[in-house]
Every structure is written in C-alpha cells, then in structure tokens.
C-alpha cells in the first residue's frame, strides 16, 4: 500500500473506561493531529477506517462492526461501544485515507473495571474548591454526546461508598453536586452513575472525580517570610559554613507559579564567584499553602563574604517581596593574658 | 441531643412594632461537634413553616437568608458555648410567630431538621 | 424562586386506610425534598429527606416517592396518631443561594 503519515502510538491520551459500560471515543486525528474536522474531510472524499491491536499481540487486525446488538460501531468519527467488555483492551488505530492521502494515529484503550465502591485503577480528575467560599459545584464530567437532549437520565452521586441522599450540605442536583461550604472534611472521591434508556436497554456510565480542597482566594495574601528575619543576625568567623535559610509562606492561589530566590550584592548566586550552594524544600499544608525553604550555604565564608548584602525575594501571583539576612563578622574574643594585663593597668 | 431556645425574655417574647428582639439556641449532647447548619423557621398563628435562613455552627463564617429576610434578621452563633442567634430588627405585626431553630449535620448521616428546638412564641403588638 | 405546593388538605381516612399526599416544586429539584409531621403546640419531626429515606425510628408505614417536580409520601395503615399536618421541604440552589421551601402543609384526619 501507499505511504501513509503515521503519527504512531498517542500515549499521551491514555484513554480509560469502565468495563460493561457505553464509550465513545472520537478519532484523536481531528482532535490533535489535523487542521481539518471530520465533516470537511468527509465532504472531501476521504474514509475513515478504524482497526486494533489486541493487548500483547502485535497483530493489527479490523474491529468487528457485525457484533450482537451493534456492540461496536461508528457514527462519524466516534467509535461506540455498547457497552465495553475487559477484553476490548488494545491499542486502535483510525486512519483517514482516500486514494491519493493517507493518516493514521493509534491510541491505547484500557478497560477498567471497578468494585462496589467505585474504586478502580482509573486515573481521577481533580476539581479543586475554595475552604469556606460560598456554594460551589463540581460537574458530573465527560457524559456529553452519549443520550440525545431528549432523554432525561437519572443521576446518583457518592462520596466514596456512600450515596449521598441528604441535602445538608452537599446538595446533588443532577449533572451538578452543590456545596454549601466546603470544608476539608469534603476532600474525597465523588462518583456520579448516570442511568439512561437507550433501543430498550438501560446503561450507566461511571464518573469518579477527586475533590479536594483548597485555600480561598479570599484569604489568599502576598508571600509571607518567615525568615530571614530581624531577630536573628547570622554571625560568623570566616573560615566557619554560613547557612542561612529563607522561608517563605505561599497562600494557595489556583495556577499561581511560586518563586523563591537569593541574591547577593543584588546578583543571582550563579552570577557571582562566591561558592555558594542553595538547596531547596518544598511543604504544603492540609489547603495546600505551601511553605519553600530555600538554604542558601557557603562552606568556607570569607570576611569579604561576611560584607555582602545577602536577600531573599518571593514573588507569587498576589506579589513580590523582599528581606535582607543580618550578616556579620564575630568580633574576636581578646586574648585572656592582654585583656587581665591591661587591667591591671600594665604598660 | 437537644437544641434549647431561649429569648424573649419575661414577657415571652412581647416587642412593640419596630423593636428589634434576639433569640438564641443552645446546642448540647452532639458527638458531632459543630458540624453543621443551624436553620432558622418560623411559624405565624394557624400558618404554615417558614424558612429564614441557616449559619454553619463551626470555624467557618457562612450563612443564607431566605430572600424576603431583607437584612432585617441576622443570624450569628458563639463557637465555644455552641450557641446560634437571631437577631430580629424592624419588626412588624407580621414577624409574630413561634420562631424554631433545627439542626442539619454536615455530613451525609441524616436528614435536614433532625432535630429541632422547642420554638419561641414572638409577638409584636403595641 | 422555589414554589412548593401541597394537595389536598384537609385529607380524611380511617384507621387501618392509606392516606397520600402530595407535593409540586415548580422547578426541578431533583430528590431534595423531606417530609415533616406537626402536631398541635409541637415543633415538626423529620419523617423523611432525600424524598424516599426513612428518618431514623421512623415507622415503615411512612413512605416517600416522586424525584424532579411531583413527589408524594404515602401513609399506609393508618393509626390514630397518625392525626397531624404535613409539610414537604424543597431544597435548590442558585449561584450563591440556597432555597429551603416549604409546602403549605396537608392536615390528615383520622376517623
């Protein structure tokens, strides 16, 4: 056959469903390979043809469209199952082809299966909400496109094993689970089980996402350093290790990039000659505020070290701040003999 | 378990049009501590129940008003002693009913107004 | 705003009969609803929340039904006691409120 673009194996979308439940996967090509949707592609000629690989064979083979009650099939660029059986899994290719184009791209399908609790191997999305916000909501996620509008599915929710019947706090409200107010007792697994009707069989997709919650925007200030401070001065000899940490206190702020950083004499410690070393650590807490200590060190101070202006800057999205370190030279203690010698006034 | 009301005072709760009144309920006995709502409901003479509005009992500061309250009550709640409050103001011949508190727990263990206080009779006549 | 409308009232049936009352949301409320049971000079008890789950040391003989706009508790075997209003709760939320709506409440005779 005729070259054809192959764009080989989409690792990056992992796609992972339920067992004995409906899927529909679209053909990644339209959605990360190509300029094209599938309608102008259609309209232009072109075929879409879908084949797999069964897990630990390498034998590519055609995917079985004739199965009892359509099992499988295609609409479009979507392939369905209804619903998938443990040993769909495989990589499956859709290749887009005509007589003069041809593209193809395989991605790896793995079906899940799941206890009574809905605990699985599925890889969890996380939806974060603010501590103490207001009412907030997460969404029962990816259910678009498997019933038509006309259809009203019923939907149950679940922290963990639990389904959730009351409305004194977390409130379901369809596709929507509301929370009066969250609080780090809410931090958990949520599972929404949407039922619907479909040719006279009834199915359910399962949705488990992770909540977690974190510190509110409302709460949220610059970044905070803890030290240095005014109330410890780093005195030292030269020849002895200056360690002289800078810690600083980020509140949580959603897609906030956090910065810790020293300067010395008002230059990046990789600008200068000095040998200088910072090691850093990394703390959250239950909201996830984080807390970075970075410990800068010079194993060998000099007295010429000890002149130096030595800061610690933060900067996060609520800001930037700055605190120099007290750094001084110890004064040596006088020697025991001069100092009993010139008190008693010996010349 | 008990949520016990008190306010009112002497007179049993009698307020002149315009007066303002607070009313308090005392939580005791809850393994739960204070996670949950406190929700305020009133009950005119022969009527039915009415919604004010609800305070979570713990740390965090949150709290709903039906919206025909219009700021005019306030609901507020004393951590430590596990009390919750409600401060009537501008009252009217209308505000007179037996004013209950009830409880609704956090978490997914049991109903809303599992329990509920005893009710305060508030009159407001000149 | 929530409407919770309560039909019929008064109801009337005998001991041992089964009485239904029913309650409208005027808008989806999903299984948000509870069932209260008032007698004269009491405050009300919970009978039943998430529109069909039985309070604890509720009897059996109550039972709820109905999810979205039309629910119903039904009481079957009919006791004396049993003599009181009911009122439903309808819960929903908007974007930064929270409405708790009662029902008018149903008067259940027994004769």
């Known amino acids: 056959s005729e070259r054809c673009d192959d764009w080989g194996l989409d690792t990056m979308r992992q796609i992972q469903v339920f067992e004995d439940e409906p899927a529909r996967i679209k053909c990644p090509l339209f959605e990360h390979f190509l300029k094209f949707n599938y309608s102008t592609a259609h309209s232009a000629g072109l075929t879409l043809i879908w084949y797999w690989t069964r897990q630990d064979r390498d034998l590519e083979e055609p995917i079985n469209f004739r199965l009892p009650e359509n099992r499988i099939s295609k609409e479009k660029d979507v392939l369905w199952f209804r619903p998938t059986l443990l040993n769909d899994t495989g990589n499956y290719t859709c290749m887009l082809r005509n007589t003069t184009y041809c593209s193809k791209v395989a991605f790896p399908l793995e079906v899940v299966q799941k206890d009574s609790c809905f605990n699985s191997p599925m890889k969890l999305p996380v939806h974060k909400l603010y501590i103490e916000y207001g009412i907030q909501r997460i969404t029962c996620p990816n259910v678009d496109g498997y019933f038509p509008s006309s259809v009203k599915p019923t939907i149950t929710w679940y922290m963990g094993c639990y389904k959730i019947q009351n409305f004194n706090n977390v409130i379901p409200e369809g596709m929507n689970l509301s929370f009066l107010i969250a609080l780090i007792s809410n931090n958990g697994n949520y599972t929404c089980v949407v039922t619907y009707p479909e040719n006279g069989r009834t199915f359910h997709l399962t949705r488990t996402l992770t909540v977690k919650v974190v510190g509110s925007p409302k709460n949220a200030v610059p970044p905070v350093i803890h030290s240095p401070n005014d109330h410890v001065v780093y005195e030292k000899e030269p020849g002895e290790e200056l360690l002289i940490p800078c810690t600083v206190y980020f509140s949580f702020l959603m897609d906030s990039r956090n910065e810790v950083w020293w300067t010395i004499d008002g230059k990046k410690p990789d600008d200068i000659t000095i040998d200088v070393t910072i090691n850093e650590s990394i703390s959250h807490s239950r909201t996830e505020d984080e807390t970075r200590t970075q410990i800068l060190s010079i194993k060998k101070v000099t007295s010429e070290d000890l002149k130096r202006s030595y800061v610690c800057h933060a900067r996060s999205a609520k800001g930037e701040v700055a605190k120099a370190a007290k750094v001084k030279q110890k004064v040596p203690a006088p020697r025991y003999t001069v100092e009993l010698a010139c008190g008693f006034g010996a010349t | 378990q008990q949520l016990e009301q008190s306010g009112g005072g002497a007179e049993g709760g009698l307020v002149k049009p315009g007066g303002s009144l607070e009313l308090c309920c005392k939580a005791?006995?809850?393994?739960?501590?204070?996670?949950?709502?406190m929700h305020w409901v009133r009950q005119a003479p022969g009527k039915g129940l009415e919604w004010i509005g609800c305070i979570y009992a713990g740390s965090s500061d949150s709290t709903y008003y039906a919206s025909w309250v219009n700021g005019r009550f306030t609901l507020s709640r004393d951590i430590d002693q596990s009390i919750g409050c409600l401060q009537l103001n501008s009252l009217t011949a209308a505000d007179t009913a037996i004013y209950y508190c009830?409880?609704?727990?956090?978490?997914?263990?049991?109903?809303?107004?599992?329990?509920w206080g005893q009710g305060t009779l508030v009159t407001v006549s000149s | 705003a929530l409407v919770m409308t309560q039909t019929p009232s008064p109801v009337s049936a005998a001991v041992g009969g089964t009485v239904t009352i029913n309650c409208q949301a005027s808008?989806?409320?999903?299984?948000?609803l509870a069932w209260f049971q008032q007698k004269p000079g009491q405050p009300p008890k919970l009978l039943i929340y998430g529109a069909s789950t039985l309070a604890s040391g509720v009897p059996s003989r109550f039972s709820g039904s109905g999810s979205g706009t039309e629910f119903t508790l039904t009481i079957s075997g009919l006791q004396s006691d049993d003599a009181a209003t009911y009122y439903c709760?309808?819960?929903?939320?908007?974007?930064?409120?929270?409405?708790?709506?009662f029902g008018g409440g149903t008067e259940v005779v027994v004769k």
């Open positions: 709760l309808g819960v929903c939320t908007d974007i930064s409120a929270v409405y708790n709506v």
């Open positions: 808008e989806d409320i999903y299984s948000n």
């Open positions: 009830a409880r609704a727990i956090a978490d997914f263990s049991s109903g809303w107004g599992d329990l």
């Open positions: 005791s006995g809850f393994s739960q501590s204070n996670n949950y709502w």
